[in-house]
Every structure is written in structure tokens, then in C-alpha cells.
């Protein structure tokens, strides 16, 4: 399995972001496919579970991403993307996309560095 991501993503605080992850595999996509998204915070704290897909999508039942993430992928199109809603500044960090598609061997985990930025104020637009 080979994984492709946007590597770096900038999004405005309070908005939603699509974390894009696509993949290629020599094996056909079927019921064995699993996708796991995790998050590594900027402060170096423990990695956190974000999302899981296996036949159906499954949101986390606890933690900061509870009720804030949804599946936006399409396995038939080799797409394992998710939507993260209502971005907060402490969502800054690295999101990892891991795709397993047996019998293909596991590939390198894809990474997206998300930067959540302030809303551009009118005065800043005027200044620019």
C-alpha cells in the first residue's frame, strides 16, 4: 500500500477541514480494508485516536474528536479522507493516515501537518 497526503494543510479556526488521504494498492479493495487516523499534538503529548474505517466508518466514542469527525472517503476510489469539524487551535499537530489492505503489505503511514490559524480580520485585509 502506498499513501498520498497533502502533507501540509492550513485552515481557519472554527471552520471545517478535509484531511485528504488517498492510496494505491496492488490488491483489490474489499472488506479487509481498514483505515486508522491518529493525531500527534504539537506539545509532544501522547498520540490520540481520531477515526477508524472497516466496512463502515466509526467515530471515536471519547476524547477531543468525539462528534467532530466524519468519513469523507470512498474506498472504491482509493480515498481514505476524513472531515474534521469546528477546528480549534489545539487541533494543531500531525494527523496520520494508516491504510491496511491485505494481502498487500502495509506501507508508510501518511502524514498531514495541520496549522489552525486565526480568522483574517477586516483590518488585516484593509492593511494588506
Amino acid at each position: 500500500v502506498e499513501i498520498y497526503t497533502s502533507r501540509v494543510l492550513e485552515a481557519v479556526n472554527g471552520t471545517d477541514a478535509r484531511l485528504k488521504c488517498t492510496f494505491s494498492s496492488f490488491a483489490p479493495v474489499g472488506d479487509a480494508l481498514t483505515v486508522t487516523w491518529n493525531f500527534r499534538p504539537l506539545d509532544g503529548g501522547p498520540e490520540q485516536f481520531v477515526f477508524y474505517y472497516h466496512i463502515d466508518p466509526f467515530q471515536p466514542m471519547s476524547g477531543r474528536f468525539k462528534d467532530r469527525v466524519s468519513w469523507d472517503g470512498n474506498p472504491e476510489r482509493y480515498d481514505a479522507s476524513i472531515l474534521l469539524w469546528k477546528l480549534q487551535f489545539d487541533d494543531n499537530g500531525t494527523y496520520t493516515c494508516q491504510v491496511k489492505n491485505p494481502p498487500d503489505v502495509d506501507g508508510v503511514i501518511g502524514e498531514i501537518r495541520l496549522s489552525v490559524v486565526h480568522t483574517v480580520r477586516f483590518s488585516e485585509i484593509h492593511f494588506l
Partner: antibody, heavy 116, light 106 residues
Framework: QVQLVQSGAEVKKPGASVKVSCKAS????????MHWVRQAPGQGLEWMGE????????DYNEKFQGRVTMTVDKSTSTAYMELSSLRSEDTAVYYC?????????WGQGTLVTVSS | EIVLTQSPATLSLSPGERATLSCRAS?????MYWYQQKPGQAPRPLIY???NRATGIPARFSGSGSGTDYTLTISSLEPEDFAVYYC?????????FGQGTKLEIK
């Protein structure tokens, strides 16, 4: 490194209440939800509930609803679990644990004995 | 609530052998967690969301399954692997644990 240090063992009489503390260090306290799990002697694990340290929001196991109260003190990075109307079946080791990719980090456990 | 039934209750094997632990859910769950617990210690996470090893867990531990049937496999037992193993579901509230499988030295 992540550490969860719990208060010491307690002996209580039936009908009393107990409050167990869990002091967290080595990570940003508000970034991870705190859970409480108990284990009766020689028995399995039972989830009691969770608390969001950022806003104090809680989700309790219905089995304990009305008897359990979970709180946090952000200034000291400490979580508390209070269980009231104790009965002998509440004799157990009580663990605090944080949810990361699983319940990855656990306190050392607090033995609560309920005996008349 | 979802009831998890682990089998066997006790498994007696020798170091170097392969261990297969089963966990069956009373209704379909999306994924499974596995924990190891030794006497006097807190549980230690082994597997999260069915097949992902927790930090620091050796490759001899693997998880699989879907729906109502899940499996923890230890490919070649080491002396330190003898302990009690619990499965846990978190696809619906409240999260629940199995009653445990005790893996003992034969």
C-alpha cells in the same frame, strides 16, 4: 512521561461516600479525557464514566448514575471520583486512566474496602 | 449494553507456542481493544481498534476480527506473556470488557 498518581487506600462503612483523587503530570491535562474503571477482587474490569477536563462535561455508566460524581481541578491537574451510598459490592480497586488511542495510561489504583 | 464473552476462560500453553484468544460480542461492534493485566498491576493496552499495536508492543501480538468475533493472537509465547487478557468494545456506550482469559504456563 505521563504519570497518574492516585490517593491511598480507603476503608468505608456501608452508606458512606468515598472520594478518590488522581493527579496527572507529564502531559497537557486538558487534552485528554479522564476515565474511571473499577475492578472488584478477582473480577473483571468495569467502566464507570469519563470527564472532559476542559469543560467538566461528564458521561457516566448508567449503572452508577446518581451515585458517582466526577470532577477536575485544572489548577492542580487533578481528577476526582466520588462514589456515594457505598455497599459491600463496591469493594474494588478504582483506577483513573486517560484515553489516547486506547485507555493507554493508568493510575496505580486505589483500593476501596466497604465493610461494616 | 453489549456483553463480551471471552474464550477459553483459561488457556494452558508452553513458551514458544502460539496462543489464540477469542472475544465474542452479543451484537456487532465496530472495533475491539485488547489489554494485558498481571497480578497487582493496572491493565496494559496491547491492541487498539482491532489490529493496531499500542506503543511498545512487540510484533508477536496481533489482533483481527469484525462484527461479533474478534481474536488476539500471540505468535510465539514468551515467559512474560503469561497473564490475564481482556477485550473491550467501544462502539457503543457504555464501553464494556470481557470477563478475561487467563493465559497460564503449562
Amino acid at each position: 512521561q505521563v504519570q497518574l498518581v492516585q490517593s491511598g487506600a480507603e476503608v468505608k462503612k456501608p452508606g458512606a461516600s468515598v472520594k478518590v483523587s488522581c493527579k496527572a503530570s507529564g502531559y497537557t491535562f486538558t487534552n485528554y479525557w479522564m476515565h474511571w474503571v473499577r475492578q472488584a477482587p478477582g473480577q473483571g474490569l468495569e467502566w464507570m464514566g469519563e470527564i472532559n477536563p476542559t469543560n467538566g462535561g461528564t458521561d457516566y455508566n448508567e449503572k452508577f448514575q446518581g451515585r458517582v460524581t466526577m470532577t477536575v481541578d485544572k489548577s492542580t491537574s487533578t481528577a476526582y471520583m466520588e462514589l456515594s451510598s457505598l455497599r459491600s459490592e463496591d469493594t474494588a480497586v478504582y483506577y483513573c486512566t486517560i484515553y489516547t488511542t486506547a485507555l493507554d495510561y493508568w493510575g496505580q489504583g486505589t483500593l476501596v474496602t466497604v465493610s461494616s | 449494553e453489549i456483553v463480551l464473552t471471552q474464550s477459553p476462560a483459561t488457556l494452558s500453553l508452553s513458551p514458544g507456542e502460539r496462543a489464540t484468544l477469542s472475544c465474542r460480542a452479543s451484537s456487532s461492534v465496530g472495533y475491539m481493544y485488547w489489554y494485558q493485566q498481571k497480578p497487582g498491576q493496572a491493565p496494559r493496552p496491547l491492541i487498539y481498534v482491532t489490529s493496531n499495536r499500542a506503543t511498545g508492543i512487540p510484533a508477536r501480538f496481533s489482533g483481527s476480527g469484525s462484527g461479533t468475533d474478534y481474536t488476539l493472537t500471540i505468535s510465539s509465547l514468551e515467559p512474560e506473556d503469561f497473564a490475564v487478557y481482556y477485550c473491550q468494545q467501544w462502539s457503543s456506550n457504555p464501553p464494556t470488557f470481557g470477563q478475561g482469559t487467563k493465559l497460564e504456563i503449562k
